[in-house]
Amino acid sequence: SQPQAVPPYASENQTCRDQEKEYYEPQHRICCSRCPPGTYVSAKCSRIRDTVCATCAENSYNEHWNYLTICQLCRPCDPVMGLEEIAPCTSKRKTQCRCQPGMFCAAWALECTHCELLSDCPPGTEAELKDEVGKGNNHCVPCKAGHFQNTSSPSARCQPHTRCENQGLVEAAPGTAQSDTTCKNPLEPLPPEMSGTMLM
């Protein structure tokens, strides 16, 4: 079998054996090594010698196999844009940011660049649960049967109605999507002026 080519090696068809870890250098018509994540090209390849890589300096990174002659500068998560850090920058990975609690990503360009406050969900509704927190604005859905939510809030969840019998009480008024069940002492009649409240 033919021996494996080691960079730099000539390539007539402008493609390299390992596309992830090698690149075609058109000036020399050869395939050269890329630099691994966390490094950059310190010396470009020639027909005689391969790429030489060096480690990214502190506060800089390269995330992929590359033939960049510089490392990218680490950027902090911008609190003014509503972002907070979830993982620090390393030589191999940029700072990982997310929207602050109560916010969602309003501007996306490969990554989130700007977060805005989540919209309130009115009484009787709650924000639909999303796979990724902060990915989109709230989509308010009605509380399911047997549940209520009585505030305007971006994060309040629908709660189950109180079961009066669990407390040794009886139902005075049924719960709605916006209010809890009203319970009363089973021995006391409900006065007209007290209707709609829970009597203990």
Epitope: Q27, H28, K44
Partner: antibody
């Protein structure tokens, strides 16, 4: 501007090891893009490339001498060195250190030391 | 290894004359990988031309290089007294880097 200066013994006995050092002044050996080389010239003959090194320690050697040649670098002293083992009278030559110019001129040599004559004799 | 053959071995000329030096490679090295050096007695070589035709920094325009493939030429349009020296070609197309045997330009 960058200057190179070779140093080492001018006389080496057969079978011993030839050791030379090249000191870089007027610039850093750690400059990105530059390899540093050793080249020799036998009396009245042409030039012969021995090998080169990068500040990180990456080396390339002339295959005809690879088994006998070692080039190393000491960035703290801004120096690189040549060791040639098991020398014979055929290794008598002027030894030059040089900078590989990089950039558009790739593996041509743009800066040279003045050379040091090494004689192999018992 | 690529062998570089320089001719003539010696060129005897007078100041003011033009000089044409030849360097022939044993295999195709394209035009990007050939350099010319000037070397005077007791001195280190000095880079004149790289990439077959590009003048190195500070080299007078009376020096020019041409050629591609296997045949390359160094031309000195009008010889100055300081131009009398040995001229070497070098290829860096493939390892090992090799040099020609030199052409001596001497005063007639």
């Amino acid at each position: 501007q960058v200057q190179l200066q070779e140093s080492g013994p001018g006389l080496v006995k057969p079978s011993q090891t030839l050791s030379l050092t090249c000191t870089v002044s007027g610039g850093s050996i750690r400059s990105d893009g530059y390899f540093w080389s050793w080249i020799r010239q036998h009396p009245g003959k042409g030039l012969e490339w021995l090998g080169f090194i990068y500040y990180s320690g990456t080396t390339y050697y002339n295959p005809s001498l690879k088994s006998r040649v070692t080039i190393s670098v000491d960035t703290s002293k801004n120096q690189f060195s040549l060791k040639l083992t098991s020398v014979t009278v055929a290794d008598t030559a002027v030894y030059y250190c040089a900078r590989v110019c990089g950039g558009d001129c790739y593996d041509a040599f743009d800066i040279w030391g003045q050379g040091t004559m090494v004689t192999v004799s018992s | 290894d690529i062998v570089l053959t320089q001719s003539p071995g010696t060129l005897s000329l007078s100041p003011g004359e033009g000089a044409t030096l030849s360097c022939r490679a044993s295999q195709n090295i394209s035009n990007t990988y050939l350099a010319w050096y000037q070397q005077k007695p007791g001195q280190a070589p000095r880079l004149l031309i790289y990439g077959a035709s590009s003048r190195a920094t500070g080299i007078p325009d009376r020096f020019s290089g041409s050629g591609s493939g296997t045949d390359f030429t160094l031309t000195i349009s009008r010889l100055e007294p300081e131009d009398f020296a040995v001229y070497d070609c070098q290829q860096y197309f493939s390892s090992p880097i090799t040099f020609g045997g030199g052409t001596r330009v001497e005063i007639k």
